[in-house]
Amino acid sequence: TPTTLASHSTKTDASSTHHSSVPPLTSSNHSTSPQLSTGVSFFFLSFHISNLQFNSSLEDPSTDYYQELQRDISEMFLQIYKQGGFLGLSNIKFRPGSVVVQLTLAFREGTINVHDVETQFNQYKTEAASRYNLTISDVSVSDVPFPFSAQSGAGVPG
């Protein structure tokens, strides 16, 4: 599954074929760039797009429907979490049920928690409906424990 990385110098997407890849933490152009030891927080996010219908095209990444929806969702998340500590999203999956979207979000550790991930996504739903014609409902966010994610970050500056 392609991965969208949050670029800190432009709004463009980069791609990776690695399944759970995260951008290298030293590639940001922040002058306070995190070191390699800086942790990453992962969140699993699921939501319904109630104004779209699932079909077999969403099981095939080569189809226009799949690529267009993935692009819109990737752009939407770059808008929502722009951008201080947002590292990107990966593992976008589409499931039946109108369209159920599942993905993983990566953030610089210590910069956000599960409640604020959900809050900011919910705050953006109205704009998503008008900008991308996506009617979003049934949002669910949970922490993803990750082995290389260090303990919560007293060392992460604001």
């Epitope: 922040h30 201080g84 910069t111 604020d116 809050t119 900011q120 705050q123 500056p157 604001g158």
Partner: antibody, heavy 119, light 107 residues
């Protein structure tokens, strides 16, 4: 290191406007939200709104919408807040404060700018 | 709008004493609460984020706890330099809101 340096104190007449600046250094200005917070004399803190300098996206507290305009100049890494139709109740210290996201906490603050509205 | 109510409004303690401030939210906000210290004529300073996460450079005597609607900030051995106003702030909903503050005084 991250620094937010605000412009100096202002004394304004009721009905006029004022534009406060917040010059930043030590980080990628375009990539973080800049928030503005008000503190009236002897009172608590009140969030006014925020701007994302990367694309100019803004969010305002409904209480201040229409009388506050937030802008940012990427070329000088400076955020601005303009207050219009000033009334005496606008007398306060105004702070700029940096955050990672739209909804977040503020680890870096400007030193504050006192705006006094008096006839 | 989420209302944050801090108590007490004033707290007077002797040095080395433990002090606890509370912040109550008008609705559940998970752990999306942050604490600031503001000394006279200074900018606020972040002490604790997300209810209990420590901040680099902040003395370890400051700690936070709570979730849902009830939160506390504790100073386990007050020093004279801790004289300040203390504010909680929520990031769970727009507009971002602050509590009215608690003033700490040293006896």
């Amino acid at each position: 290191q991250v620094q937010l340096v605000q412009s100096g104190a202002e004394v304004k007449k009721p009905g006029s406007s004022v534009k406060i600046s917040c010059k930043t250094s030590g980080y990628a200005f375009s990539n973080f939200w800049m928030n503005w917070v008000r503190q009236a004399p002897g009172q608590g803190l009140e969030w006014i709104g925020q701007i994302y300098p990367g694309d100019g996206d803004t969010n305002y507290n409904a209480k201040f919408k229409g009388r506050v305009t937030l802008t940012a100049d990427k070329s000088t890494s400076t955020a601005y807040m303009e207050l219009s139709s000033l009334r005496s109740e606008a007398t306060a210290v105004y702070f700029c404060a940096r955050s990672y996201y739209r909804s977040a906490w503020f680890a870096y603050w400007g030193q504050g700018t006192l705006v006094t509205v008096s006839s | 709008e989420i209302l944050l109510t801090q108590s007490p409004d004033f707290q007077s303690v002797t040095p080395k004493e433990k002090v606890t401030f509370t912040c109550r939210a008008s609705q559940s906000i998970g752990t999306s609460i942050h604490w600031y210290q503001q000394k006279p004529n200074q900018s606020p300073k972040l002490l604790i984020k997300y209810a209990s996460e420590s901040i680099s450079g902040v003395p370890s005597r400051f700690s936070g706890s709570g979730s849902g609607t009830d939160f506390t900030l504790s100073i386990n051995s007050v020093e004279s330099e801790d004289i300040a106003d203390y504010y909680c702030q929520q990031s769970n909903n727009w507009p971002l809101t602050f509590g009215q503050g608690t003033k700490l005084e040293i006896k």
